[in-house]
Each structure stands twice: as structure tokens, then as C-alpha cells.
């Protein structure tokens, strides 16, 4: 390893960073996550912590730019120099800049998150096999409704997993139409449009009307970008592939290397290359933003290039899915900042007397293997007709299931998960949920189908929480998490994306812990979680009984309700209230009788 002359380094350990702008290549949440994971590599082996802030006085300002982008070091277009970073110090020092002429991915092709289908929002897998053919972009093949879709595994024919790609026929973004899909054709300034347009705008954004007549209804949305089929180079850079297209009299419904000697994939950007001669290169594997960021952050922390070819700080990009940090990187960063301190030795814990009633006999917790079936919003798979539009989420469309005794919340022994959402208590069980508002004579409403309101979710949930500021809903099931903002979902993501190790089999609950912070629980352990960064602080790991003496050690759900913490075990809860920094159990009761006010018959 090498460090900069004078061992340039930060002289405080709580480093802040600001993501000043974004690349269009990846969803913002994926970019946020890539940077958070890149910082986590370095914090895992040093005393450093990294906190995301939202102002330019952050230590490390992260910026995407092209060519001359405001410093003395212009970028060089696609490939070559991918990014650069400045050694630690004030002002621009310590900042990291990423060349947005690159295709940013996670190293394995464009990241296209899907919606609906049966893949729980997983990203497309490019290339994928469908009916024996290879596809390197989303396709409408096999469908009659024109909706682009992709396989989320390498082979649709064998795995049958798919989702719908971003498409204006499925939804729009922003605008004023609540995300409704485009209506084609539509009238704008007396003219008919059968595709998204930039007309009427000076910023180049593609938009459409969501009714047949924009002039009359004034309802519109922006068309989602399609990273998988946005071409580079050629003579139509930035335009979309048009599938199918005709080349030398033959029809192509995916990118092709025909007519080229170098094997590079290309497509036409009109339906007929032979007549229009408009084309561009299809996206390649791209560069892993996570790996490049991890390297750049090494520089921003004071590491120069390493001469060890396997090291992250070696000056050549190399995609790897293994652990990025080499011993040489660890030695280098520890030379500057020292090792991560060991957790303080804990005094032997004395067992806190448990409340005597009710009994503490309980199941060991929910099974970690979940039913394989997933509710599908939309078609069960391409080909065939699909949704005319995404199912709309919201109370008004929630389907009430015909009532049977088991569908009465008062007959549910143990709920999968409980959460306060808005001002109501939501109770989840086996693909269904109930809503409860406290009040004299109140009864839980429902059951409703989870699939109607949150179509991406599995039937079995371990825990749920709402972050009040952003109104984001976090749903945990096994080793996965889904984050809903209104009707749009990010996920599923693995728990390790949140900084939780492979030894964490599930998240069993969450409690608020200050502005934008939560405590996440898993069995006997808990972590502090930053909602904006969507990362746990790995050093905040603690034992539940240290912070909440007197609660059972094998709770299967932890939730907050009316500003108090509830620890569920079997049919019972232990309620904890905080007084002057002390967490004390102040009530033990039954979920059904004491919270839901069910009759004791």
C-alpha cells in the first residue's frame, strides 16, 4: 500500500458525505446503497464512521459529472478515467467525482428494476433466455399488450421468473397524474401523439398525457427511462432501441452483433435500419459503482494506489463479486486510522426477573423458510395478456376477503407482524392484514389482502415499520426487505444491503430512536438503523436485554404503538415505556384482548 505524502488523512473519525447529484443509469436508491456499502467496507476495518448529510459542508462531496465538470481535471468520455477523488482536506479535498459518460451499473449490465410479475421487484438479468433465444434488453415478445418485460434469472424458460420493465404503458413518474400510465394516442396542442414526446419542453424530458386529450384534461406524467435500451455512440446516442427493427430485410427483436466484425451489440433506433440508418450500441456490462466508489473513497481517506494487483486500491478496474478489500488495503487504511476498536468487554449479565404472568412458553419464532408462492399482480407470466395498468394501491381498492372464523383478527393466535402505520395499527398474518383504530367499541377492520395493497410482498412477513418523516414502509421477510413509498417499491433487497451480516436470519422488529433513526431487532440482538442511508451502524450492535431489561429474549415481533414499545412472544406482549432514559416493562398483556379489545369469550 501507499499513502499520500505526509500521510494526508482526516483528523476526525465521524466522516460525513453528501451525494450532490445522481446518474440516470441507476435508480437513486441503488446509488445511495452502492455508496453506503462502499463506505461500510472501510468503516468495518477502522474506527471511522460515515454519515450521510444533505449539505455542501460534508467532508466528502460525491458528484457525477462529464468532461469539464468544475475542477481542474476534466473527464475523458466513456471508459478510460472512470472517476477521481481528492485526498483528505478542506473544500474540494476529499471529494469524489464519477464520470457520467460511463455506464454505471453493479458490474453485470444495466440495472433495470421490475414491477409486478412474479419476481418481487428483482432486477432484470441480462442476457436472459426466452423460448431458446437470448435477450440483452427488455422485450415485448410473447405478449400481445406491448408491455416490455424481462426475466430476472438467466433463463426464463427454466425458471419462469419475470417482471415488467419501466414503461410508460405501465406507469409514469412525477407529473400530476398520480403515476397513471400514458394514454396513446393523446392530443397535445391539437396534434395526435402515439409515443412519449419532448415537445413543449425545453429540458428534453420525455412526457405523455395520461388521458386522451391533454389540451382538455391537462393530466400528464414523465415517461420512465429505459436504461436497458438507451443506446450509446452510433448516430443516435441517448435514443431508445426500437424493437423489432429491420436490418438487411430481417427482423430483430433484440440487440444484435450482425453486420459487425467486433461482436459488439447494436440496435436500430427506428423500426427500419435499412431505410433510416439510425443506430447505436446497446449497453455493455457497465462499471460497478460500488467497486469504483470503494476505490475512490480509499483515495478520499488518504490511500494512494497499491502495487498489489489483487488490492482494491490497485489502479485498474476489475469486476469481482468476492470481498473487495485485500489485506493490503486493510493494512493501508489501518496505517492511517488504526484498527476498529473491539467492543468493550461486558460485565456478566444478571438475569432480570421475568413477569410471572402470562406464561413464557413460546414457539422458537416464525419459520425462516417461507412459502414459495408469491401473489402476482398482473399476468402469471409472459406470454399472454397482462394488466391494462398496474393495480392501484390504496384502501379504496383493498379487497375484503369473505369472512370465516380464522379471518376474525380476534381468532388469530400469533400475528406475523404488527406495525403502527399512520394512526392505525396494522396486523399481518398469512397474506392478510387488519387495521385497528383505538377507541371505545373499536374492532379490527378486515381482513384485506396484502397483495392488493402491496403487490410485491410475500405472504409471510417478519416485521413492518413506517418511517414517519418520509412515510416509507419497510417490510421484512426472511433475509429480504421491501421499501414502499406510496405505491412504488424498492426491493426485494437482501439484509446485507442494510449492513446486516449473513448471520442475521430475519428482522423481527423495529422501534423509533430519534429523528430518522430506528432500532432494528433480530432475536436477542439490535442495531441502530439510519433510515435515509438505509444502513445499520454495525458498531451499534447490542443485546436486547441490555437496553430493555425484563423483556423476553425470544420475541418474534417488536413494534411501536402510541409511543410505547411492544415486545411480542407467543400471544403476549411486554410493553416498555421510557422514563428518564430508563426502559421499563410497565405492562404485560394479550395482543387480542388488551390491544385489540377483543371480547374474552
Amino acid at each position: 500500500f501507499q499513502t499520500f505524502e505526509g500521510d494526508l488523512k482526516w483528523h476526525h473519525h465521524n466522516i460525513t458525505y453528501w451525494i450532490q447529484n445522481y446518474s440516470e443509469d441507476l435508480p437513486r436508491a441503488v446509488i445511495d446503497d452502492a455508496f453506503a456499502r462502499a463506505f461500510a467496507l472501510w468503516s468495518a476495518v477502522t474506527p471511522l464512521t460515515f454519515t450521510r448529510v444533505y449539505s455542501r459542508d460534508a467532508d466528502i462531496v460525491i458528484q457525477f459529472g462529464v468532461a469539464e465538470h468544475g475542477d481542474g481535471y476534466p473527464f475523458d468520455g466513456k471508459d478510460g478515467l472512470l472517476a477521481h477523488a481528492f485526498p483528505p482536506g478542506p473544500g474540494i479535498q476529499g471529494d469524489a467525482h464519477f464520470d457520467d459518460d460511463e455506464l454505471w451499473s453493479l458490474g453485470k449490465g444495466v440495472v433495470v428494476p421490475t414491477r409486478f410479475g412474479n419476481a418481487d421487484g428483482a432486477a432484470c438479468h441480462f442476457p436472459f433466455i426466452f423460448e431458446g433465444r437470448s435477450y440483452s434488453a427488455c422485450t415485448t415478445d410473447g405478449r400481445s399488450d406491448g408491455l416490455p418485460w424481462c426475466s430476472t434469472t438467466a433463463n426464463y424458460d427454466t425458471d419462469d421468473r419475470f417482471g415488467f420493465c419501466p414503461s410508460e404503458r405501465l406507469y409514469t413518474q412525477d407529473g400530476n397524474a398520480d403515476g397513471k400510465p400514458c394514454q396513446f394516442p393523446f392530443i397535445f396542442q391539437g396534434q395526435s401523439y402515439s409515443a412519449c414526446t419532448t415537445d413543449g419542453r425545453s429540458d428534453g424530458y420525455r412526457w405523455c398525457a395520461t388521458t386522451a386529450n391533454y389540451d382538455r384534461d391537462k393530466l400528464f406524467g414523465f415517461c420512465p427511462t429505459r436504461a436497458d435500451s438507451t443506446v450509446m455512440g452510433g448516430n443516435s446516442a441517448g435514443e431508445l432501441c426500437v424493437f423489432p427493427f429491420t436490418f438487411l430485410g430481417k427482423e430483430y427483436s433484440t440487440c444484435t452483433s450482425e453486420g459487425r466484425g467486433d461482436g459488439r451489440l447494436w440496435c436500430a433506433t427506428t423500426s427500419n435500419f435499412d431505410s433510416d440508418k439510425k443506430w447505436g450500441f446497446c449497453p455493455d456490462q457497465g462499471y460497478s459503482l460500488f467497486l469504483v466508489a470503494a476505490h475512490e473513497f480509499g483515495h478520499a481517506l488518504g490511500l494512494d494506489h497499491s502495487s498489489v494487483p489483487e488490492a482494491l486500491m490497485y489502479p485498474m478496474y476489475r469486476f469481482t463479486e468476492g470481498p473487495p478489500l485485500h489485506k493490503d488495503d486493510v493494512n493501508g487504511i489501518r496505517h492511517l486510522y488504526g484498527p476498529r476498536p473491539e467492543p468493550e468487554p461486558r460485565p456478566p449479565t444478571t438475569t432480570t426477573p421475568q413477569p410471572t404472568a402470562p406464561p413464557t412458553v413460546c414457539p422458537t419464532g416464525p419459520p425462516t423458510v417461507h412459502p414459495s408462492e408469491r401473489p402476482t399482480a398482473g399476468p402469471t407470466g409472459p406470454p399472454s395478456a397482462g394488466p391494462t395498468g398496474p393495480p392501484t394501491a390504496g384502501p379504496s381498492t383493498a379487497t375484503t376477503v369473505p369472512l370465516s372464523p380464522v379471518d376474525d383478527a380476534c381468532n388469530v393466535n400469533i400475528f406475523d407482524a404488527i406495525a403502527e402505520i399512520g394512526n392505525q395499527l396494522y396486523l399481518f398474518k398469512d397474506g392478510k392484514y387488519w387495521r385497528f383504530s383505538e377507541g371505545r367499541g373499536s374492532r379490527p377492520q378486515g381482513p384485506f389482502l396484502i397483495a392488493d395493497k402491496w403487490p410485491a410482498l410475500p405472504r409471510k412477513l417478519d416485521s413492518v415499520f413506517e418511517e414517519r418523516l418520509s412515510k416509507k414502509l419497510f417490510f421484512f421477510s426472511g433475509r429480504q426487505v421491501w421499501v414502499y413509498t406510496g405505491a412504488s417499491v424498492l426491493g426485494p433487497r437482501r439484509l446485507d444491503k442494510l449492513g446486516l451480516g449473513a448471520d442475521v436470519a430475519q428482522v423481527t422488529g423495529a422501534l423509533r430512536s430519534g429523528r430518522g433513526k430506528m432500532l432494528l431487532f433480530s432475536g436477542r440482538r439490535l442495531w441502530r438503523f439510519d433510515v435515509k442511508a438505509q444502513m445499520v451502524d454495525p458498531r451499534s450492535a447490542s443485546e436486547v436485554d441490555r437496553m430493555f431489561p425484563g423483556v423476553p429474549l425470544d420475541t418474534h415481533d417488536v413494534f411501536q404503538y402510541r409511543e410505547k414499545a411492544y415486545f411480542c412472544q407467543d400471544r403476549f406482549y411486554w410493553r416498555v415505556s421510557s422514563r428518564s432514559e430508563l426502559n421499563q416493562v410497565d405492562q404485560v398483556g394479550y395482543v387480542t384482548y388488551d390491544i385489540l379489545q377483543c371480547p374474552e369469550d
Epitope: 499520500f4 469539464e68 468544475g70 475542477d71 481542474g72 481535471y73 476534466p74 475523458d76 468520455g77 471508459d79 478510460g80 478515467l81 472512470l82 472517476a83 477521481h84 477523488a85 481528492f86 485526498p87 482536506g89 478542506p90 473544500g91 474540494i92 479535498q93 476505490h295 475512490e296 483515495h299 494512494d304 494506489h305 489502479p315
Partner: antibody, heavy 123, light 107 residues
């Protein structure tokens, strides 16, 4: 030992062309940004052009569209093709090597310079 | 473009004296500044980079300081071989620019 050796200068008429070369040795040429800097007689230094290892080029406004920088990494040689020469292009032309390379940035300066080659544009 | 202004244009000092050369940028350039020495008929030679780091082989009597817009090159005790023209150069913003130079002559 790092060495940079320019050649190709001389007397040329306005509107004429010249091609300067800079032969490099003693370092991994292909990894470094390489620059041309000129100095008019009795005047200060003025940057002319730079080429990155990837081949990306940048030019001073005064020479844009007339000069072309290039490199041949297999021959460890930097070039400057000068067309449509003007009297004000008269100068000693130096090639220079960046002290640092790659993606970490401090202003590290030009740590090695050639001895310079004189270009005189006159009728 | 960022303008680099050096002062004084000429500095006359005797051997053994302390020389202080100034360079001012028209806007902040952080510490992205280099100093060069040029003797007649020779190519420039890098003295200081990143405002304060001595280049390889440069004697300890040369030092650089400053950040933002104001920078100083100091020669603590002048030797006969130090008489030359000194240039500052910025790379805090594109394009790079040089100062017009300070001539250091024997008094």
C-alpha cells in the same frame, strides 16, 4: 532515468504545417497524461494541449481546431500536429509529463520537461 | 479562466537574504498550485507541488505555503544558483494557467 526529447521544430511560413515529436523513456509512458506547453520569446509559459492515457484530448482556445495532439504508446512518443500556423504560434514548444497519473488528484505539477524545440512562423 | 498574478515582477536581493515571492489567484484554487524555476535557455523545473510539497531533489531552503487564493514561495537563504524566473501555475479549475513570472536577480 526519465527523458523527454522533442524534435520537429523549424521555420515555417504562415498557414503552413509542422509536426512535433516527443520521445519518452524511463517511465511507463502509457499511464501518464502528457502535455505540450509553449513559451514565446521573452514571454511566460502557456499550455497548449494535453492527452490522457485513454487518448482523450484537450486544447487551449488559441490552438483549437488547428493543432492535434496524439500519442503512440507502442513507440513511447507524443506528437503535436500544427496546421494553419500563425506568427503568434512562434515559440519554444516543450513536452511535459504529469507527476501523477490516474484517479487521485492533487495538483502534482509537471515533474519532467523536454529541452524544447523552437518553432518560428515567419514569411 | 483563472488569472494568476505574481508579485513583484522583479525582486532584487543579495545572496544569503530571504526571498518571498507571491502568487494570487482570481478565485479559490484550494491547494492546486505548483511553482517552477526557469533559467535562461533551459526548460522549467518543478520546485513545489500541491502548494507546499517540495519536489524530488529540491533543497530544503525552498518552501511553499498558502491555499485558496494567496500563495507564497519562500527561499530562506539565497544561493547564487537561485537567480532565475519563477512561475506559479494553478489547476484548481480548468484550464490550467500560469502566472506571468517573477524575475529574481542579484542585487
Amino acid at each position: 532515468e526519465v527523458q523527454l526529447l522533442e524534435s520537429g521544430g523549424g521555420l515555417v511560413q504562415p498557414g503552413g504545417s509542422l509536426r512535433l515529436s516527443c520521445a519518452a523513456s524511463g517511465f511507463t509512458f502509457s499511464q501518464y497524461d502528457m502535455w505540450w506547453v509553449r513559451q514565446a520569446p521573452g514571454k511566460g509559459l502557456e499550455w497548449v494541449s494535453v492527452i490522457y492515457p485513454s487518448g482523450t484530448t484537450f486544447y487551449a482556445d488559441s490552438v483549437k481546431g488547428r493543432f492535434t495532439i496524439s500519442r503512440d504508446n507502442s513507440k513511447n512518443t507524443l506528437y503535436l500536429q500544427m496546421n494553419s500556423l500563425r506568427a503568434e504560434d512562434t515559440a519554444v514548444y516543450y513536452c511535459a509529463k504529469d507527476r501523477a497519473y490516474g484517479d487521485y488528484v492533487g495538483w502534482n505539477g509537471f515533474d519532467y520537461w523536454g529541452q524544447g524545440t523552437l518553432v518560428t512562423v515567419s514569411s | 479562466d483563472i488569472q494568476m498574478t505574481q508579485s513583484p515582477a522583479t525582486l532584487s536581493l543579495s545572496p544569503g537574504e530571504r526571498a518571498t515571492l507571491s502568487c494570487r489567484a482570481s478565485q479559490s484554487i484550494s491547494s492546486f498550485l505548483a511553482w517552477y524555476q526557469q533559467k535562461p535557455g533551459q526548460a522549467p523545473r518543478l520546485l513545489i507541488y500541491d502548494a507546499s510539497y517540495r519536489a524530488t531533489g529540491i533543497p530544503a531552503r525552498f518552501s511553499g505555503s498558502g491555499s485558496g487564493t494567496d500563495f507564497t514561495l519562500t527561499i530562506s537563504s539565497l544561493e547564487p544558483e537561485d537567480y532565475a524566473v519563477y512561475y506559479c501555475q494553478q489547476r484548481g479549475n480548468w484550464p490550467i494557467t500560469f502566472g506571468q513570472g517573477t524575475r529574481l536577480e542579484i542585487k
